[in-house]
């Protein structure tokens, strides 16, 4: 069928394939120090690692892409590791009238796949 | 704000940045020749090209990723060009009783962004 089963074990060795990883960043790193009060140090999870053939394929398109990349590597890029879902996080903002809380739904990755 | 405006003009030159491109493929390329009918090559659209800083950022996460990649390129990958939406397409399947139609919602990319 069009939807061959995506592979879930990494053929490249532990930690090499697409996975979620925690990255530390300061407000200065993000250019946010003038308008975010808290947290000062952010723990962000990001999707990193390679996407070997059919590993964690996001969907049918990603499977086709993997297959065509094998046949036409100069024309079709390999799938790459991107968020499949996000975790909402709350930031404390400076505002004209003081401070407010704002939820961001698309800031921290919760899961990853190859797209 | 967290959501700086994503850039929409390509600083690398025409056709170099993340965009939708049509790719030709045969049923044999896709491993579909035993179960899909098609009198001619298939046309597929895929997302190709680079994602320079803040170009077509998918969301806040992608903007953060771009910024951290600039600071920690060994640890944080650059955003990459993936589908933002898909176009439903119909495939003609061989079945035991003849031929039938099936719609796939995630086979052909309709738009691209940097995630």
């Amino acid at each position: 069928s069009a939807h061959a089963h995506p592979r879930d074990s990494c053929p490249l060795g532990p930690g090499r394939c697409c996975h979620l990883e925690t990255v530390q960043a300061t407000l200065e790193d993000l250019g946010w120090s003038d308008w975010v009060l808290s947290p000062r140090q952010l723990q962000l999870s990001m999707c990193v690692g390679e996407c070997p053939h059919l590993y964690r394929s996001a969907n049918t398109h990603a499977q086709i892409k993997a297959r065509l990349h094998g046949l036409q590597p100069d024309k079709v890029p390999a799938p790459c590791c991107v968020p499949s879902s996000y975790t909402p996080v709350v930031l404390m903002h400076r505002t004209d009238s003081g401070v407010s809380l704002q939820t961001y739904d698309d800031l921290v990755a919760r899961g990853c796949h190859c797209a | 704000s967290a959501h700086a405006h994503p850039r929409d003009s390509c600083p690398l030159g025409p056709g170099r940045c993340c965009h939708l491109e049509t790719v030709q493929a045969t049923l044999e390329d896709l491993g579909w020749s035993d179960w899909v009918l098609s009198p001619r090559q298939l046309q597929l659209s895929m997302c190709v090209g680079e994602c320079p800083h803040l170009y077509r950022s998918a969301n806040t996460h992608a903007q953060i990723k771009a910024r951290l990649h600039g600071l920690q390129p060994d640890k944080v990958p650059a955003p990459c060009c993936v589908p933002s939406s898909y176009t439903p397409v119909v495939l003609m399947h061989r079945t035991d009783s003849g031929v039938s139609l099936q719609t796939y919602d995630d086979l052909v990319a309709r738009g691209c962004h940097c995630a």
Epitope: - | L20, T22, L27, V36, L37, S38, P39, R40, Q41, L42, Q43, S45, T87, P88, V89, V90, L91, M92, G98, V99, S100, L101, T103, L107, V108, R110
Partner: antibody, heavy 123, light 108 residues
């Protein structure tokens, strides 16, 4: 809901060209295949060709190859059909019709149609 | 090129079942669609892929296809079903092909 609105009736001289437009609303224009089908007075339906905006490619029925050009403008969600070297036998109602993209076949399953444009070729 | 042959006309008594045929070489191995066209109007898709109906098309309309004949069946025919009906499939190079059309007359 989806609507296809075509340009108005035309009267043309033999040997000239005609260009008919078809403006789509209420759907994602680039996600579908747009065909042109004609119907001569008292006759049946005849597929002329079509275009898939997302791929930017047109296909034509062999009978019309070289005489018909089908284009699409995504910015206005409009498809166009230009027929050249007109003769009296080209007098017909010209319909645009939309359907899903059928991989490898491209066109068919026309689930929405324009209202039709009458083109009369007469000297 | 692939040809589809339909009878020029079919008559049915009000409330009875009408059958409109569409013949083509080994048409049973093709996908066939059917369109209804009333005078002065654009065609409407009524059946596709054997016997699927688009939304808004009554269950009275059904299709079948085997061997060299595809059939559109209209049960409990109504005066409003009076129209021209066209079958459609594809030729060997993937071009759209229509049948010549059948005029359905509902008597009574």
């Amino acid at each position: 809901q989806v609507q296809l609105v075509q340009s108005g009736a035309e009267v043309k001289k033999p040997g000239s060209s005609v260009k008919v437009s078809c403006k789509a609303s209420g759907g994602t224009f680039r996600s579908y295949a747009v065909s042109w089908v004609r119907q001569a007075p008292g006759q049946g339906l005849e597929w002329m060709g079509g275009i898939i905006p997302i791929f930017g490619t047109a296909n034509y029925a062999q009978k019309f190859q070289g005489r018909v050009t089908i284009t699409a403008d995504e910015s206005t969600s409009t498809a166009y059909m230009e027929l050249s070297s007109l003769r009296s036998e080209d007098t017909a109602v010209y319909y645009c019709a939309r359907g899903p993209i059928i991989m490898g076949y491209q066109f068919g399953l026309f689930d929405h149609w324009g209202q039709g444009t009458l083109v009369t070729v007469s000297s | 090129s692939y040809e589809l042959t339909q009878p020029l006309s079919v008559s049915v008594a009000l409330g009875q079942t009408a059958r409109i045929t569409c013949s083509g070489d080994n048409i049973g191995s093709h996908i066939v669609s059917w369109y209804q066209q009333k005078p002065g109007q654009a065609p409407v898709l009524v059946i596709y892929d054997k016997s699927n109906r688009p939304s808004g098309i009554p269950e009275r309309f059904s299709g079948s296809n085997s061997g060299n004949t595809a059939t559109l069946t209209i049960s409990r025919a109504q005066a409003g079903d009076e129209a021209d009906y066209y079958c459609q499939t594809w030729d060997s190079i993937g071009s759209v092909v229509f049948g010549g059309g059948t005029k359905l007359t509902v008597l009574g």
